[in-house]
Structure formats: C-alpha cells, structure tokens
C-alpha cells in the first residue's frame, strides 16, 4: 500500500540503487517514486553532515522485503516511494529554494526581475530542467538578477551549494504549465536522428512516448516495431535529444515510428503509467513471483499491488493453468522495461499500474458566509482540489468554494445550501483558475446528492459541513485532483504552513474575484480564539486562523472552500471556511470547520453502495 510517513533523524542502511543531489527530501521522494526500482530513500540536508560531497545527498534504495534497517543519523530524513499512492504521484515540483545554488550545465543567462520570472523562463525553454537566480542583494553586482537556465545528464543538479542571495528551483513543465506546447502527432515510417539518451524495449510507440515524456533528457523518440528488419532492434525505443531541442533530420524508414515528448504540453500530461494489456505478447524479465489468478486483469491488479512488480505476463498455456486460474508471472528489470518482448505467444502482458495517479474511486485520507482578504493570485494547478460552487437561476453566479476529496465527492460548508437545497440549480466547476474563463461550453459537474450534516442548523456556526456526491466521477489531472483528509481526531500535528483559497470578496463590502486568491494564515489555538469571540462558543470541532493585526482572511464567497496545511511535504484539508466576525478584522480570526473531527461522518457517508469504503489511506 501507500506509505507517506517520513522518518526524521533516520537513514536506511544498504539497498542503494542510485544517488543524486536534491534540494530537499520531498524532491528526493519524487525521484524515488519515478525510479523503476526505488522503494525507499534517505536524504541528507546540508545541516546533517559535514562532508561537503554528501550534503543534499539523495540515496535511492530497493529492498526485496520492502524495508531496510534504519540507523540514527541526526538531521537525515528517510521515507518511502509514493508508488501506489494514486493522485499523490506527480513529477511537478513548484518549490523555490532560497540560499541554494543548484549546479548543472549553464546554457542560458538572462537578466530578470524576479525568481518567478526565472522559473517561467525555465519552464518555457525546452532544454531547461532547473535554474538559479541571483537576487538584487547578491554580493557580486554584475551577477545580480541573473537567471541561469540549466540541465544535467540525470535531470538533477550535479551539485548543490549553500550560497546567500541565490534562489533555485525546477522547471514547471511536469506541472503542465509550459507555454511551449507539444506535438501530439505520431509519425509512421519515420526515424529521427540526433543523440540517443537511452534505449528501452516497449510493446508500442505509445509506451515509448510516455517513457520519453518522463525521462529527464528525452525530447523526442524513434520506435522500431516488432517487424523491423533487424531482429535484435525490434521493439527498441530510442530516447533522443538535440542541441536545438528538435530533430536535426528525419529519415523515411519502414516499420519505425517517431514522435515527441509530451512534457511541454499545456494543461494535460499523460499519466506516468501504461494501462494497456497486450494479448499474444510475453514480457521477459527477472522473476519476482508466480501466482495462479483468474484472468489477465486480476494478474495486472496483482502486479500493481506488489510494489516491486513492474510488468507481468499472464500465461494461457494449458500446462500453466488449473481450472479457471492460470499462471501470472510478476517480473521486474533494472530500467522498468521488459528485457525481452516475444510475439505470437499464448500469453498476455502488461505493466503495473503503481504509477497511475487516478487511484481507485475513493476519497483520500491519511491514517456566516466567509471570505479572501489580503491575498494574492494563485497559479494554474497550485490548488487542484479547489472547486467553484455556482448557482444557475436566471443568471449564474459563484456562491461558495469546495474541495475535491474523491473522484465523485466534494466537501464544503453546510451553510452554502441555506435556502438553496435543490441539487438541480447547482453547477460545480473544477480545474479552473479564472471565473471569467467559464463560458456556456465549459464542462461542469452536476450534483447527484447533497448530504448536510444531520446536526447542522441554519444560521448557526456548528457542524457547518456538507458532502456533495457528483453525478459522474471526475478524472484526475495536474489541475483537478483531490486533497488528502487528516487522520481522525488529528490533534497532535502542529501545522505551521496553512493557506486559505477562494474567489470570495477581497474586502468586507467587496465583490467576487476573477482569479483564485490565496492567503497564508497562521492557526490560532481554540483557547485564544474563544477569547476573541465573546458571544460564540468555539468548539473542538472548529479551528481558527488569522493574524492578530487582521488584514488577511477569507471573506464572502470563500465559504465551503479549503483551509489546507502542508506537513511533511503533503497538503491536508484541515478546515472548511465557515464563519467569522466581518472579514480580516483585527483580533477576529476566521473560524473553520475542523475536518479531523468529522472523519467518521465523512467515511460513513462516502461508503459506496456495495459497502466498500471509498477511502484510500496513504498512511
């Protein structure tokens, strides 16, 4: 299953399959997730080690048993790959690292006014993998405001150095935010020239293209089909790059297929997994396990559940079957691709779905109309769980926010439905940033069921929580995916990085905003919060957030939206925007419904009709 916990001051001994430099443990975990053999990782922050060569070291590890002995090492951080973690699997990494220089091949230098602009340049440059930016206070005047675009053979820095007034980060191409755009075309009977960066075996050009998309240096590819004239080159997928970023030449060639990486696509990237099953094909590799199962789909499920399994072959040979069950060969290799592909067999083959980010049809967990004041514009894909709840009567208008918590579930505030309990009048927009982008052609979800907490009473602040079941399940993308829920009764976690988002008023007597707003707000203890509200009881089912001096808060139209906190690299839905005394007033924190206190209720209500809990727990 999915394991998200991080181990502080611990280092996994042995099992090394690769090492690299990464700026933090979360990026190291992401590299582990996408490495075909990595199950565990250990990261050494700069503060944890004196050896300059090992600072920022990210060590990727494998283990036959799925675990390794942990040794105490002050400052080290260890954890698990996020394979099997559904929607948490993403190559997108937005963080910017202050005081850090990520070294690599500097291929472009320009003057820019901010680190955000530098990151944008990197994202819009086909070869840029990461960047460094010298701020206005950098010690050497001639380097100030320099934006250095970089790449390296492995896509990670060749070294990371602590350096004042330098900020570094990664390209946002894996976030589907590139302005470059991509070539979806597949070119039959055409071979591209240029530099081969890797060679793998794949059953078709589509798998080849997905592997190219997620390979750090692949810009385009050529695939040799299973009828290619040279037998030893059949099913070979050549991953390629060039100085210019495009093929310098292409040659008409029978039984070859070429195409481009889809990393530069805007708004949608392919999933980092291959779900197709190939009948009459055997995939060769190192044997992990053999089990008898009923049908090829069960074989694929078995492979997906066994975390080390990369691909499988389901044999229909009479000697491999007994009754309705046949042998399911679970296999792996060094690069995650078959070492041999044979056609015309009595088998069916395919890949593990451990890196698919759709997951199951579940909601995600780990073991007064209010409002954004003092916020800033959000960017695409920053808060992919945020939805807009709109009402269409004569005109259509945004009324509340909500949070996507599963393919078919949205969590919001009960008071959003005060006076409007009819499900037909509601339209739910997901995967959007600007309300002005909504036209009559914009797809929206309709409500199948509104479930208001049984103890909620109109115009009271208590139990302000509601679930919405959508008529049809939503697919997950970089711009539309769920937020994880906290553990039941989560009281021990101290959240220090919390954000509220919404399209609500930007001042107390304002209007709905066009661009989704975000504001970083500290949590306030319930005891402190209670002292600020002389007439209302702040219960343990509420959580408060706000600045002593005011100025930043949620406001009208943000109700029902998320209060999310980042902990150990993972965002969790801590609160639902509920009520407050005005907006952003001094000494009047916003009051949010505490989601952890309603976990039993959420789980009970999101049970599917067959009684299977629609929850997926990464803890």
């Amino acid at each position: 299953g999915c394991l998200t916990q991080l181990y502080e001051n611990a280092f996994f001994r042995g099992g090394d399959v690769a090492s690299m430099y990464t700026p933090n443990a979360q990026y190291c975990q992401m590299r582990c997730t996408f490495h075909p053999r990595c199950l565990l990782f250990s990261f050494l922050p700069a503060s944890s080690i004196n050896d300059m060569e090992k600072r920022f070291g990210c060590f990727l590890k494998d283990s036959v048993t799925g675990t390794l002995p942990k040794v105490h090492r002050t400052g080290a951080v260890s954890g698990h790959s996020l394979k099997q973690c559904g929607h948490q699997i993403s190559a997108c990494h937005r963080d910017i690292y202050k005081g850090v220089d990520m070294r690599g091949v500097n291929f472009n230098v320009s003057k820019v006014s901010s680190v955000e602009e530098c990151q944008k340049r990197c994202t819009s440059n086909i070869r840029c993998q990461f960047f460094s930016y010298a701020t206005q206070t950098f010690h050497k005047a001639e380097y100030r405001n320099n934006c250095l675009l970089k790449y390296s053979p492995g896509g990670t820095p060749t070294a990371i150095k602590v350096l004042s007034n330098v900020e570094s980060g990664f390209s946002l191409k894996p976030c589907a935010l590139s302005e470059i755009g991509c070539h979806m075309n597949i070119f039959q009977h055409l071979a591209f020239s240029d530099v081969d960066v890797a060679r793998v075996l794949t059953p078709d050009a589509f798998v080849c293209r997905t592997i190219c998309t997620y390979h750090p240096n692949c810009l385009f590819f050529t695939f040799y089909t299973n009828v290619w004239k040279i037998e030893s080159q059949r099913n070979v997928c050549l991953l390629k790059t060039s100085e210019s970023g495009t093929p310098s030449s292409s040659t008409p060639q029978e039984n070859t297929i070429s195409g481009y990486s889809l990393l530069t696509c805007k708004r949608t990237l392919p999933e980092p997994c291959h779900s197709k099953i190939y009948p009459g094909v055997d995939f060769g590799g190192e044997e992990l396990n053999v089990t008898f199962v009923k049908g090829v789909n069960v074989c694929q499920e078995t492979c997906t559940k066994m975390i080390r399994c990369q691909f499988f072959t389901y044999s229909l040979l009479p000697e491999d079957c007994k009754e309705e069950k046949c042998k399911c060969f679970l296999r792996l290799s060094m690069d995650g691709s078959p070492t041999r592909i044979a056609y015309g067999t009595q088998g069916s083959s395919g890949y593990s779905l451990r890196l698919c980010n759709t997951g199951d049809n579940s909601v995600c967990t780990t073991k007064t109309s209010t409002r954004i004041v003092g916020g800033t514009n959000s960017s695409w894909g920053e808060w992919p769980w945020q939805v807009s709840l709109q009402v269409k009567l004569t005109a259509q208008r945004h009324l509340c926010g909500g949070s996507l918590i599963g393919h078919q579930w949205v969590l919001t505030a009960a008071h959003c439905f005060d006076g409007l309990p009819l499900q037909d009048v509601w339209r739910i927009y997901s995967g959007i940033l600007n309300l002005s982008d909504i036209t009559k052609d914009t797809p929206f979800s309709q409500i199948k069921e509104i479930i208001i907490h049984q103890n909620y009473k109109v115009s009271e602040g208590n139990h302000d929580i509601a679930l919405i079941k959508l008529q049809a399940p939503l697919n997950y993308t970089e711009f539309q995916k769920p937020i994880c829920l906290p553990s039941k009764g989560d009281t021990s976690t101290i959240y220090t990085n919390c954000w509220v988002t919404g399209w609500g008023f930007s001042k107390e007597k304002g209007e709905i905003q066009n661009i989704l707003q975000k504001v970083n707000i500290p949590l306030v203890t319930n005891e402190e919060c209670q002292k600020r509200y002389q007439d209302y009881k702040i219960t343990q089912r509420m959580v408060c957030a706000g600045y002593k001096e005011g100025g930043k808060d949620a406001c009208k139209g943000d109700s029902g939206g998320p209060l999310v906190c980042k902990h150990n690299g993972m965002w969790r839905l801590v609160g639902i925007t509920s009520w407050g005394e005005g907006c952003a007033r001094r000494e009047q924190p916003g009051v949010y419904t505490k989601v952890a206190e309603y976990m039993d209720w959420i789980l009970e209500k999101t049970q599917s009709s067959d009684g299977k809990a629609q929850m997926q727990s990464p803890a």
Epitope: N462, Q530, K531, R532, Y533, Q534, D535, K537, I538, E587
Partner: antibody
C-alpha cells in the same frame, strides 16, 4: 429572543444544600457556555464556574472548588448550580449567563439566603 | 491567580463630565479585559470587551483603552442613565472581576 429564566429565591439552613436552575429560551444551551456568577449583598461580582452543556465539561474558580457543582440537562435546555455545606458566606444573588469567551447575556439572578 | 485592582471605588460627577475609571492587573492580561455596567436590581450588562471593542448596541460615549497591566474605561459625556456600578473583568486566565466603581451624579 434570547432569555435566561432563573429559579425563585431560596431560604436555606446552614449546612444544607440547594440547587438553582437556569432555563434557556431562544437558543440551544448546547451551542454555548453557561457561566455562574455570585454577588454578595453590597459587594462585587465573583466568577464561580462554567459548563459546556454539550459535553458536561466544567471549569471552576479554584477558590470555591467543592462548594459548587455545575450540571446541565440539554433535553430541558436547563443548567443547574448545586451549592453544598452552606454558610452565611454563601448568602448572595447567583446569576447564570451565556456566552463564548465572556458572559454576554445574563439571567435575572436568584437570591439565596442562608439563615438558621 | 490574577488580581484586578479597580479605582476609584466611588465617584460623583456632573452630567456632561468626562468620567475615567482605571483597572490594574497583577500580570499582563494580553488586552483581555471587559467592562460591565450594573444598575441597582439588575444583572450586569457587557459594554466593552478586548480592551476597546464596543459591544453592539452600546453608545459610543463609552470607550476603553490600555495594554499590558493598565487599563482605562471612559465615559466621554456622563448622562443621567449612566448612573450605575462599573466592573472590569480580566478573561485572559479564567475570570477575575475588579471591586467595582459606583458612579453617582453630583
């Protein structure tokens, strides 16, 4: 309209106990705290304690711990103050009040006279 | 325990006068002070909370100020209906009332 109706005056003997009631209307006591405050004749105000009727959590002034017991019955929307081992020092008006961080709305008070 | 020392215990002033009452806390109470008005035969009424926030429906002639341990309650222009006893209350740590100030008209 928010109202707190307190029980009538009590004349009790030293050493006895008394139970005062405070019945709420216009709101549900589960959604608030009920506070009790004592005011001796011609004297100031003293906080006795607070109850959260939703879960019966109580807080008392440490100086009077043991003298007072706070309870609530959510079905009748009523809070109670029980005073035990009464002495002349306990002769006072006892107020119930509702609120969150503070006592925002008050009952009319109940006079308790302790006399042999 | 936090003690609240209120002064004066009684005062008389003319209609239209500015009236000032002070409260001193034995510890810093983080501005968590409220002021109540009590008229004879009635329960107290909340006027001000969190040092200076006026409870809704309370006339603007009532105000509060201060920080740390020293706080002031002011009636900018005394009216006949303001004759009452005024109490300060700290609510930073449990609840403690001041001894009260009786305001009379000269």
């Amino acid at each position: 309209e928010v109202q707190l109706q307190q029980s009538g005056a009590e004349l009790v003997k030293p050493g006895a106990s008394v139970r005062l009631s405070c019945t709420a209307s216009g709101f549900n006591i589960k959604d608030t705290y009920i506070f009790w405050v004592k005011q001796r004749p011609k004297q100031g105000l003293e906080w006795i304690g607070r109850i959260d009727p939703e879960n019966d959590n109580t807080k008392y002034d440490p100086k009077i711990q043991g003298k007072a017991t706070l309870t609530a019955d959510t079905s009748s929307n009523t809070a109670y103050l029980q005073l035990s081992s009464l002495t002349s020092e306990d002769s006072a008006i006892y107020y119930c009040a509702k609120g969150g961080g503070l006592f925002a709305y008050w009952g009319q008070g109940t006079l308790v006279s302790v006399s042999a | 325990d936090i003690q609240m020392t209120q002064s004066p215990s009684a005062m008389s002033a003319s209609v239209g006068d500015r009236v000032t009452i002070t409260c001193e806390a034995s510890h810093d109470i983080n501005n968590y002070i409220a002021w109540y008005q009590q008229k004879p035969g009635q329960p107290p009424k909340l006027l001000i909370y969190y040092t200076s926030t006026l409870q809704s429906g309370v006339p603007s002639r009532f105000s509060g100020s201060g920080s740390g341990t020293d706080f002031t309650f002011t009636i900018s222009s005394l009216q006949p209906e303001d004759i009452a006893t005024y109490y300060c209350l700290q609510y930073d740590n449990l609840f403690t009332f001041g001894q009260g100030t009786k305001v009379e008209i000269k």
